[in-house]
Amino acid sequence: EDELQVIQPEKSVSVAAGESATLRCAMTSLIPVGPIMWFRGAGAGRELIYNQKEGHFPRVTTVSELTKRNNLDFSISISNITPADAGTYYCVKFRKGSPDDVEFKSGAGTELSVRAKPS
């Protein structure tokens, strides 16, 4: 069985302020079991954007139906983009752990740039 890979196909995405940004992410396997999360930035100060397991993320919607048992698409759409949303977004697969899940593999990241709202 090939080891899971996290694929973020776009290195960068540019969106006009006020629009929605779609950040694409796909897994090559469902194994190991565990949640995916999206972060802005890397390292200790990274910001959680979406957690598959729990939480309320009103600006984030998943592109695919994550309740499908065979789902491998973990792309997200972030609504009402502002310049403050600019940064590099990482799709990260965790494997289950107790008491805390363990980071397993990260995508290469997608840099989101925000253009001025067209007048």
């Epitope: 079991v33 139906e65 065979n70």
Partner: antibody
């Protein structure tokens, strides 16, 4: 409060069909995958079928594949189990259950009894 | 198939451990379900290996390692007497499986 209420259980003859319903309330039904689980008299719990939140994907245990069909109507907050070609081995209490993000169960209905007897 | 002991017994206040084996840790999540009488609605006491619903007392805890999961009841009470079922969800097969159930008797 999350509530799941099954209905449709009855006494039927072998070979007949039955449709069970599960009415959901207290949560956003269209956001959750759902399952049916049964318990035969004196036996343990047996998972039968699951369905994704949107209803497009369904999953079954081998023993009911082709005879049972799980479906849902998100506009009515309802889950269904269509059971065909029933046999005495299908006699059981049937429960609907809400799935967690990783396809285990967090909430259960009270169950509805199906008896298949000639 | 998931394997669990048919029965366990304990005195009030003791710690009870119920094991469930047979799943692949890498691909399986475990849950534990309490049923106080046959045909009554099961109650989820643990899901996702170790997550306890908010309305379940803290004396119930879960863990998983290797090919087994464990339900621990610390300071068991008479009202905990029930049948406990373990269940697994296998991410390889997309199938849920239940163990045969463990009858807990509080002496």
């Amino acid at each position: 409060d999350v509530q799941l209420v099954e209905s449709g259980g009855a006494v039927v003859r072998p070979g007949e069909s039955l449709r069970l319903s599960c009415a959901a309330s207290g949560f956003t039904f269209s956001s959750y995958a759902m399952s049916w689980v049964r318990q035969a008299p004196g036996k343990g719990l047996e998972w039968l079928a699951g369905i994704s939140a949107g209803g497009s994907d369904t999953y079954y245990i081998d023993s009911v594949k082709g005879r049972f069909t799980i479906s849902r109507d998100n506009s009515e907050n309802s889950l269904y189990l269509q059971m065909n070609s029933l046999t005495a081995e299908d006699t059981a209490v049937y429960y609907c259950a809400r799935e967690t993000w990783n396809h285990l169960f967090d909430y259960w209905g009270l169950g509805t009894l199906v008896t298949v007897s000639s | 198939a998931l394997t669990q002991p048919a029965s366990v017994s304990a005195n009030p206040g003791e710690t009870v451990k119920i094991t469930c084996s047979g799943g692949d840790w890498y691909s399986t999540y475990y849950g534990w379900y309490q049923q106080k009488s046959p045909g009554s609605a099961p109650v989820t006491v643990i899901h996702s290996d170790d997550k306890r619903p908010s309305d379940i007392p803290s004396r119930f805890s879960g863990s998983a390692s290797g090919s087994a999961a464990t339900l621990t009841i610390t300071g068991v009470r008479v009202e905990d007497e029930a049948v406990y079922y373990c269940a697994g969800y296998d991410g390889r097969t997309y199938i849920n499986t239940f163990g045969a159930g463990t009858t807990l008797t509080v002496l």
